[in-house]
């Protein structure tokens, strides 16, 4: 028998510093956790205690802290190349920047070989890229060899800017004749790594035939056997094990996201390649780890240009942005509206001739707007302005709806009118007329959204049966606010960019902007 | 880390006036809504006042209902509470505190203030 | 205002024991509830918030749920450093506090 350890990480995000144990700005050094630094330190502890090791990243480095928004994926390669991963897969986060933003800063300077199976090049980008992503990587660890092939989700051009010349394919119709080809070569030991999901990381467990282990991302599926070191409650045992339509044993695992913890599997195999055993658990990286003297230190160093890029100029604003407690809980207000329009504009995506974009929609808590802008400081508008705009370090995601959910949440928004509490609703792409006379659960008289398939958008009222993809704050996908009805009830969700990187980018990309108060938000005659 | 420092309490007379501060520090202060909350001796805890983050919203409880004045200076990243025309009745250890009840919540230690003749 | 009531408002437990404390509000809260544990001479700690969400750093053996008007804390296997007294809150309107709930050691 010979003994395997997989080491991964998953949907990190841009977390290289030590983060507070929700995966938000570290507040309290002796209770904050993961960080590169810190992982570093549990990594290298297990390289020399154990023979066989492997460490592996299932994709997402890219995006979610202001380490993204300066450096665009440069520490990505550098930190990663640091810890000596062994091999990543493309997540859909990758293809945030395009594809230059993940050529250049990624692609080119990675030491690891960085994997998808089911991306498919073609045009001019086909010679471009050639070789700079592989489907599959033969790895050599002690006497034996390992084959890592990857894959990505379907959805990325979705959820990501991977351009036209990207096509991106079924995992299992892309990833079968990959671990043929493996199997070809004599590797008798395959790894499945990628980015889908842990619905799609059982099916590839399931259905793809001589794939041994899979270790998934995307769905951040926290999976944990015995008593949970911290506030994530499991999905399942560590590793789950699907039962693959050959009658194997194939352990599934992930490892939550942020980089607070750190996956650990140990696979024995027989000599034929069969799995006899797996068994591990995510360790937790807190503070009873140390962080790693070297490699804060670089982090150090990188964090300097972060603290000067707060200060610079992304735009312009000609009016006053509103984001007061009495605007922003109480009534539309140009805060919100600009916001809203920035998270639409994040999410462009023309992938088909039939629909101007696949979503129109945007609701935001006011509650979440957390100052205003004043114009009249030269109409600057900073980073330093927008972190206190959104305090909290959220993404803004995509989900999918039913339009009787939706009528839910705006009757929430109101249900409790005029105590300044933050589930009041900012829109984008929505217009919404309200009646405070009537009691609550009964006040959305109108709710109009506006049409994704149409050449001229235009609005309509919104049908209880039909599904929309709407775009909002990660704390509302998870039924904050007393948002409960999204959570229970949204049929897929999708984790997005960095809230203030989203603004900031629409800012620098429209230069000079002047958000109004124009009629999204009504109030019918007589109550308000 | 984060610190809720109240000061300002001490012992006063029926009738008379008492002005509490909170310094705060190890977040951002101006982007959080601000409680008092206050517990006398050997009793339960009651809520007495909150206010926006931006200062544009003020709620009080009906037992301090015109007597007492929440606001902050977000410059000085500090909040205050004005009690005037104070009673026996408002006894109490009073706290400070972030965004109750939610993931933000955080209070101070508290400052003792004793109305008695 | 929203009244909140609690029961027991003292009882005693030994370490070990799975423990349960509910709060009844005088109408419907939806889920904005949360609990507390408060130690003598210190500040109240936020346990739970949103009937059922556990707090960063609380031990996992502290459990919320409910919605509406019934809420119930529970603590799976008390250890000797849950003997506190336990408030409800709701932020439904504005905030109103249970009695409290004395846990002591039997």
């Known amino acids: 028998a010979w003994e395997l350890t997989i080491l991964h990480t998953n949907d990190v995000h841009s977390r290289l510093e030590q983060t507070s144990e929700d995966s938000s700005k570290c507040v309290n050094a002796s209770r904050c956790m993961g960080g590169v630094a810190r992982l570093f330190t549990k990594v290298q502890q297990i390289r020399r205690a154990e023979p066989n090791v492997l460490l592996l990243d299932a994709g997402d480095q890219y995006q979610g802290t202001i380490w993204f928004t300066v450096y665009k994926g440069a520490e990505v390669a550098h930190f990663m190349n640091a810890l000596r991963y062994d091999a990543m897969a493309l997540g859909n986060h990758e293809f945030d920047n395009g594809v230059e933003g993940l050529i250049e800063p990624l692609l080119k300077e990675a030491k690891f070989p960085i994997l998808s199976a089911n991306i498919k090049a073609k045009g001019p980008l086909a010679s471009q890229i050639s070789g700079l992503y592989l489907p599959y990587k033969v790895l050599p660890v002690g006497d034996e060899v390992v084959g890592i092939v990857g894959y990505t989700s379907k959805e990325t051009p979705f959820l990501s800017n991977p351009g036209t010349n990207l096509v991106f394919e079924d995992e299992i119709t892309a990833l079968q004749p990959e671990v043929d080809k493996l199997k070809t070569l004599n590797v008798n030991k395959i790894i499945a790594l990628g980015h889908s999901g842990f619905e799609m990381d059982k099916l590839i467990a399931q259905k793809v035939r001589g794939v041994d282990v899979v270790v998934g991302g995307h769905s951040n599926t926290f999976l944990y056997t015995g008593n949970p070191p911290s506030k994530e409650v499991p999905a399942g045992k560590y590793p789950f094990i699907v039962t693959s339509d050959d009658g194997r044993k194939v352990p599934v695992v992930q490892a939550y996201a942020f980089g607070k913890y750190l996956g650990y599997l140990k696979i024995e195999f027989d000599e034929r390649g069969n799995v006899i055993s797996s068994h591990g658990n995510p360790i937790l990286l807190n503070s009873s780890i140390p962080e790693d003297p070297s490699i804060k230190a670089d982090i150090n160093k990188w964090r300097i240009k972060l603290d000067n890029y707060s200060t610079q100029e992304l735009g312009k604003t000609i009016v006053y942005l509103d984001g007061s407690s009495q605007s922003c809980r109480f009534r539309e207000c140009n805060m919100g509206n600009l916001i809203c329009d920035a998270m639409i504009n994040n999410n462009l995506r023309h992938t088909d001739e039939m629909f101007w974009n696949h979503v129109s929609m945007c609701i935001l808590n006011g509650g979440g707007i957390r100052s205003p802008i004043d114009e009249r400081n030269n109409g600057t508008i900073t980073w330093e302005n927008l972190a206190a705009v959104l305090p909290f370090g959220g993404t803004f995601d995509l989900v999918q709806l039913k339009g009787s959910t939706l009528k839910k949440a705006f009757e929430h928004s109101v249900h409790r009118y005029g105590q300044s509490t933050g589930e009041f609703l900012q829109v984008g792409g929505i217009h919404v007329v309200y009646d405070l006379s009537r009691k609550p659960g009964d006040r959305v008289v109108k709710l109009d959204v506006l049409c994704t398939k149409c050449r001229v958008p235009s609005y309509d009222p919104l049908k209880m049966d039909e599904v929309y993809k709407v775009i909002l704050p990660n704390f509302l996908a998870n039924g904050g606010d007393g948002f409960q009805m999204i959570k229970d009830e949204l049929l897929r969700h999708d984790s997005g960019d960095q809230d203030i990187n989203v603004v900031s980018t629409y800012i620098s990309k429209m230069k000079v902007i002047y958000p109004a108060v124009e009629g999204r938000i009504k109030f019918s005659t007589g109550s308000h | 880390e984060v610190q809720l420092v109240e000061s300002g309490g001490g012992l006063v007379q029926p009738g008379g006036s008492l002005r509490l501060s909170c310094a705060a520090s190890?977040?951002?202060?101006?982007?959080?809504?601000m409680h008092w909350v206050r517990q006398a001796p050997g009793k339960g805890l009651e809520w007495v006042a909150v206010?926006?983050?931006?200062?544009?919203?003020?709620y009080y409880a009906d037992s301090v209902k015109g007597r007492f004045t929440i606001s902050r200076d977000n410059s000085k990243n500090t909040l205050y509470l004005q009690m005037n025309s104070l009673r026996a009745e408002d006894t109490a250890v009073y706290y400070c505190?972030?965004?109750?009840?939610?993931?933000?919540?955080?209070w101070g230690q508290g400052t003792l203030v004793t109305v008695s003749s | 205002a929203i009244q909140m009531t609690q029961s027991p408002s003292s009882l005693s437990a030994s370490v070990g024991d799975r423990v349960t404390i509910t709060c009844r509000a005088s109408?419907?809260?939806?889920?904005?509830l949360a609990w507390y544990q408060q130690k003598p001479g210190k500040a109240p700690k936020l346990l739970i918030y949103?009937?059922?969400t556990l707090q960063s750093g609380v031990p996992s053996r502290f459990s919320g749920s409910g919605s509406g008007t019934d809420f119930t804390l529970t603590i799976s296997s008390l250890q000797p450093e849950d003997f506190a007294t336990y408030y409800c809150?709701?932020?439904?309107?504005?905030?109103?506090f249970g009695q409290g709930t004395r846990l002591e050691i039997k």
């Open positions: 505190a972030t965004e109750i009840a939610a993931k933000g919540d955080y």
């Open positions: 190890g977040f951002t202060f101006s982007s959080y809504d």
């Open positions: 206010m926006s983050y931006d200062g544009s919203n003020k």
């Open positions: 109408q419907g809260i939806s889920n904005y």
């Open positions: 949103a009937a059922s």
């Open positions: 809150q709701q932020s439904y309107s504005t905030p109103h």
